[in-house]
């Protein structure tokens, strides 16, 4: 079974409705908003999580220089269209027939258009740069300890294999975590870096998506690591297509 059998809940996604109506009376959980069945033994896709979030009550809310093609999610929340596997559909539209193309993490990668806009494929985000600023501490964290603890966090909490944590950079108080995962590297059962980054982002904001699991308590050699700012950059396998007007704005 994929959910906690005894009390029929979804450990990895609290934005679900669960009931023992699966095969053989097993616990089955469905994401809010989409009603899609989710695998509670792993992370739920970001698309289904965003859809669930939009359906929930509204009160529930050496350093690397990002490449010129890096995307930041400036558009904020929207109610996405997800495919049958829970991935973002390449084309997203709002209720007023304004459409745009997104990448595999659901971030807009083209100018907005109308219903005639074509998005031929879902472009994969293969490199994510998580930029954190930590609160002041007595001294700087030891870089190798910080690196090891963050790799451990992504493996232990988000199931992301250490090979996908490409690097951890640190210049006090800024920490940068680089996640890399090409299409060819991602095997069956591997967590997507986009999903891991989203769970991490929500954890950092104190909005954990896990059911019953404690909030994020990140420590480096016993010293609490408290984050006060997060910025996430997304790099796609194919550069985004924006007009010059946006680039000079």
């Amino acid at each position: 079974h994929t959910a906690a059998q005894d009390n029929c809940t979804c450990p990895t996604n609290k934005m679900t409705v669960c009931s023992p109506d699966g095969p053989g009376g097993r616990c089955q959980c469905r994401a809010l908003g989409s009603g899609m069945a989710v695998d509670c033994s792993t992370l739920t896709s970001k698309c289904l999580l965003l859809k669930a979030r939009m359906s929930a009550p509204k009160n529930a809310r050496t350093l690397v220089r990002p490449s010129e093609h890096a995307l930041v999610d400036n558009d904020g929340l929207y109610d996405p269209d997800c495919d049958p596997e829970g991935r973002f559909k390449a084309r997203q539209c709002n209720q007023t027939s304004v459409c745009w193309c997104v990448n595999s993490v659901g971030v807009r990668r083209t100018d907005k258009g109308d219903l005639s806009l074509r998005c031929d494929e879902l472009v994969r985000t293969h490199h994510i740069l998580i930029d954190l600023r930590h609160r002041p501490t007595a001294g700087a964290f030891n870089h190798s300890d910080l690196d090891a603890e963050l790799r451990r966090l992504f493996r232990e909490r988000y199931r992301l294999h250490p090979k996908f944590v490409a690097a951890v950079h640190y210049e006090q108080p800024t920490i940068q975590i680089e996640l890399r995962q090409n299409t060819s590297q991602k095997a069956a059962g591997d967590v997507d870096i986009g999903d891991a980054a989203y769970y991490f982002e929500r954890d950092i904001k104190g909005e954990s998506l896990f059911q019953g699991r404690g909030g994020l308590d990140l420590r480096v050699r016993g010293e609490p690591l408290q984050v006060e700012r997060t910025l996430i950059y997304y790099l796609d396998e194919i550069p985004p297509k924006f007009s010059m007007k946006r680039l000079t704005a």
Partner: antibody, heavy 120, light 107 residues
Framework: EVQLVESGGGLVQPGGSLRLSCAAS????????MSWVRQAPGKGLEWVAN????????YYSDSVKGRFTISRDNAKNSLYLQMNSLRAEDTAVYYC?????????????WGQGTLVTVSS | DIQMTQSPSSLSASVGDRVTITCRAS??????LAWYQQKPGKVPKLLIY???NLADGVPSRFSGSGSGTDFTLTISSLQPEDVATYYC?????????FGQGTKLEIK
Amino acid sequence: EVQLVESGGGLVQPGGSLRLSCAASGFTFSTYTMSWVRQAPGKGLEWVANINSDGYNIYYSDSVKGRFTISRDNAKNSLYLQMNSLRAEDTAVYYCVRCSYYSYDYFDYWGQGTLVTVSS
Amino acid sequence: DIQMTQSPSSLSASVGDRVTITCRASENIDNYLAWYQQKPGKVPKLLIYAATNLADGVPSRFSGSGSGTDFTLTISSLQPEDVATYYCQHYYSNQLTFGQGTKLEIK
């Protein structure tokens, strides 16, 4: 001193069930990923299953998926392996093993093992 | 799944010899490789992790090398207590696999 002590092995008929236990001591059990590894008589080592520190993330080898269930009780410093629908090829010494702290899945400490024999 | 192939399956060498055991992965595993020693009738013991790093308490005559698909465990000067079966294991993916083992004996 790190100690891992397995129990629960024995003789069971094909199709039967068995529950193995592992009592851990000498380290902070609740912060380590744990695994079961088995070794058929006179054969090599085979990884069976992994469970992360808080029990949320679990992996199984293809050979036992759907039949075996790994679990843990951090309050009791214990690791378990529930084995159902046992087959003759499951006959082996089952080792309780600790994964490295930083969640790389190699095994830094091994228990003495408990023998499971599946035979009619 | 990634297959691990060790060679030779068995070998016999004299005390003081330099001994080399190889392990080949069916696909790239970077340096996500460990080596274990299992003495007759005993429990396996970690020797090497991350392909080249010596585990605590392991004598310096043991060393590991390699990256990608080809790896080597070397014993620089064989001692009588090194009689054992040696296993490699990858941890590059979620499906962990061991090599079939190399049995080392003293001539």
